[in-house]
């Protein structure tokens, strides 16, 4: 009896695991084995596929074959008993295009109100993703074990911290990887659960903000208790993407070691241009808080988002305000690379009632003023880009008197 070729061959590639599955064409024929050949693009000859010769089952693994994952290959299969079936050719494919991202490895650490998540690719030193290792992003689903209400968090990197959790509570989560450059979404990891710790005596510092004053960065935060010391650490934000980086290490800012106030000042120039993460920790000498939430800090935006400078032309019933580029040391104007909007606050010198104008233009009219009255003005700049969402500090207030009653023209 002629053997029929096997049919319906499926190629499954997860990370560096290459699996073939197929259907027997004739279940009634026993003791049949199956063999595969492969052919690379541009080659005429077929080569035996190691790991997939004389297979008795309907599944084989050819992961040991060192293929160029970006090169198209063709497979063919036949059944063998005393004689052989004709070859059945599988549609050609490119391994990289066909590959799925496997479940990542996940390691959790608990704090009282936070969980630290360390994520790494499921296959170490993967050949499939060798050129894309730094391009992985991850998403996760987290839920309280007791409620099951899920929260999704997208676009995170290999080290991530989830804040604002409840102490002594079990949370469960699962993580999957994505390669957005190749439109690939991976499969979820197994579910991992961890219980947050007992509430720490000292809460972490909160509401951390960075501003620029006189060529310095001013880092401020809030804290619940007095008589504390604080330390600040920095990390280059890029390192968050790179799980295996042996240079991943939070470092102290010397000016912000063991400070006794809820702020510290350090020079703009100590950081090379880039995006950094900052975190703050409190201590009372015996106990130490967990680290605060990390804030992102972009030297290029922070450094250049200085308060605007402006001139005032006074009329009887209005001010004309002309906004110019801020000056850095040496009186040279700073070039702003970002579209800005200006917030102008003005008030009568004898009153606390402030009024506000928001303007995109650099020449602004402040209307409805009283003649021969002293008004004060201060201004600050905001980036218009939602993602950057930065504001300068307010400029120093400038006070001017309006002109007598008939000079409004």
């Amino acid at each position: 009896k002629n053997l029929k070729s096997p049919q319906k061959v499926e190629v499954d590639i997860i990370d560096d695991n290459f699996i073939l599955r197929w259907n027997r064409s004739d279940e009634s024929v026993g003791n049949v084995t199956f063999s595969f050949d492969y052919q690379k693009t541009g080659m005429d000859n077929w080569i035996k596929l190691s790991g997939c010769q004389n297979i008795t089952s309907t599944k084989c693994n050819f992961s040991s074959l060192k293929l160029n994952v970006y090169e198209e290959i063709k497979l063919r299969i036949r059944a063998e008993k005393e004689n052989t079936s004709s070859w059945y050719e599988v549609d050609s494919f490119t391994p990289f295009r066909k590959a799925q991202i496997g479940p990542p490895e996940v390691h959790l650490e608990a704090e009282d109100k936070a969980i630290v998540i360390h994520i790494s690719p499921g296959t170490k030193d993967s050949v499939m993703w060798a050129l894309d290792g730094l391009s992985f992003t991850y998403s996760l689903v987290i839920w309280k074990n007791s409620s099951g209400v899920e929260e999704r968090i997208e676009n995170i990197y290999s080290r991530h911290k989830i804040y604002k959790l409840s102490p002594e509570t079990t949370y469960c989560l699962k993580v999957k990887a994505a390669l957005l450059t190749s439109w690939k979404i991976g499969v979820y990891s197994p579910v991992h659960c961890i219980k947050t710790t007992v509430e720490n005596e000292l809460p972490p510092p909160e509401n951390i903000e960075v501003s620029v004053q006189n060529q310095n960065y001013v880092l401020k935060w809030d804290y619940t208790y007095a008589n504390m010391t604080f330390q600040v650490q920095w990390l280059h934000a890029f390192l968050k993407r790179n799980p295996g980086n042996h240079l991943y290490k939070w470092k102290q800012i010397p000016d912000c070691e063991n400070v006794k106030t809820t702020q510290c000042v350090f020079p703009q120039n100590v950081f090379q241009k880039g995006i950094y993460l900052l975190r703050v920790q409190a201590s009372d000498g015996n106990n130490t808080s967990f680290w605060s939430e990390e804030i992102k800090f972009d030297t290029e935006i922070q450094a250049f988002l200085l308060p605007p400078v402006f001139n005032i032309r006074s009329l009887s019933d209005s001010f004309h305000i002309y906004i110019g580029a801020p000056k850095q040391s040496g009186n040279t104007p700073v070039i702003q690379d970002y579209p800005l909007i200006y917030e102008i606050i003005f008030w009568e010198n004898t009153s606390n009632a402030e009024r506000k104008i928001i303007e995109k233009k650099t020449d602004v009219t402040v209307p409805n003023l009283k003649p021969l009255t002293v008004y004060c003005v201060k201004a600050r700049a905001h980036t218009m880009d939602e993602k950057l969402n930065k504001s300068s500090v307010f400029s120093d207030a400038v006070c001017e008197k309006t002109k007598p009653g008939n000079t409004s023209k």
Epitope: L134, W234, H236, F238, L239, N242, N245, L247, K251, Q252, P254, D255, E257, F266, P267, N269, V270, F271, Q272, K273, G274, Y276, E300
Partner: antibody, heavy 117, light 107 residues
């Protein structure tokens, strides 16, 4: 292991342009900061400038009119070009990595340049 | 630019001794100071940053201290591999500048 290796001509004539290459292995130059530092015959060290992971640059103002630092990410290399060299540019040139502040945790072996007519 | 003055320019000591190298800045550098060791024909190696933080892998016999404008590097119980040149470098403002070096020789 991060490794840096400088390469260059060794000898140059006054007014020529110096071109040096730093080849980085074990780490991608699309992370962190990649610097040039030189050491003069009297052992004085001078910071020259950097190119960052994003391609932004900083040059020591004392060299600003003559220096250019560029990179080729596909080769994992970065380059120093110094125009109009004089005898005073005779030095050992080092490439070095930094992580965000201006101190240097990985250095190349250095390449010696002699400027002489 | 901030100037860094290092002393002594050279010193000789024996294995097992303790030595101290000092560095003075022309202005307050707020602990933004690094120390490097360089052996003949080799590249500099980072020993200390932030005035007192030892770089990973550096033996604990090295220690940095100081504040304001005055800083020092102390090497306890000198080992044969410690001989070479030492440089301080500030990174409080740009451009960063280096000290002129201290050559540590075997007595």
């Amino acid at each position: 292991e991060v490794q840096l290796q400088e390469s260059g001509p060794g000898l140059a004539k006054p007014s020529q342009t110096l071109s040096l290459t730093c080849s980085v292995t074990g780490y991608s130059i699309t992370s962190d900061y990649w610097n040039w530092i030189r050491k003069f015959p009297g052992n004085k060290l001078e910071y020259m400038g950097y190119i960052s992971y994003s391609g932004s640059i900083y040059y020591n103002p004392s060299l600003k009119s003559r220096i250019s630092i560029t990179r080729a990410t596909s080769k994992n290399q970065y380059y120093l070009q110094l125009n109009s060299v004089t005898n005073e540019d005779t030095a050992t040139y080092y490439c070095a990595r930094s992580g965000g502040m201006y101190y240097f945790d990985y250095w190349g072996q250095g390449t010696t340049l002699t400027v002489s007519s | 630019d901030i100037q860094m003055t290092q002393s002594p320019a050279s010193l000789s000591a024996s294995v097992g001794e303790t030595v101290t190298i000092t560095c003075r800045a022309s202005g307050n550098i707020h602990n933004y100071l690094a120390w490097y060791q360089q052996k003949q024909g080799k590249s500099p190696q980072l020993l200390v940053y932030n005035a007192k933080t030892l770089e990973d892998g550096v033996p604990s016999r090295f220690s940095g201290s100081g504040s304001g404008t005055q800083y020092s590097l102390k090497i306890n119980s000198l080992q044969p591999e410690d001989f070479g040149s030492y440089y301080c470098q500030h990174f409080w403002s740009i451009p960063p500048t280096f000290g002129s070096g201290t050559k540590l020789e075997i007595k």
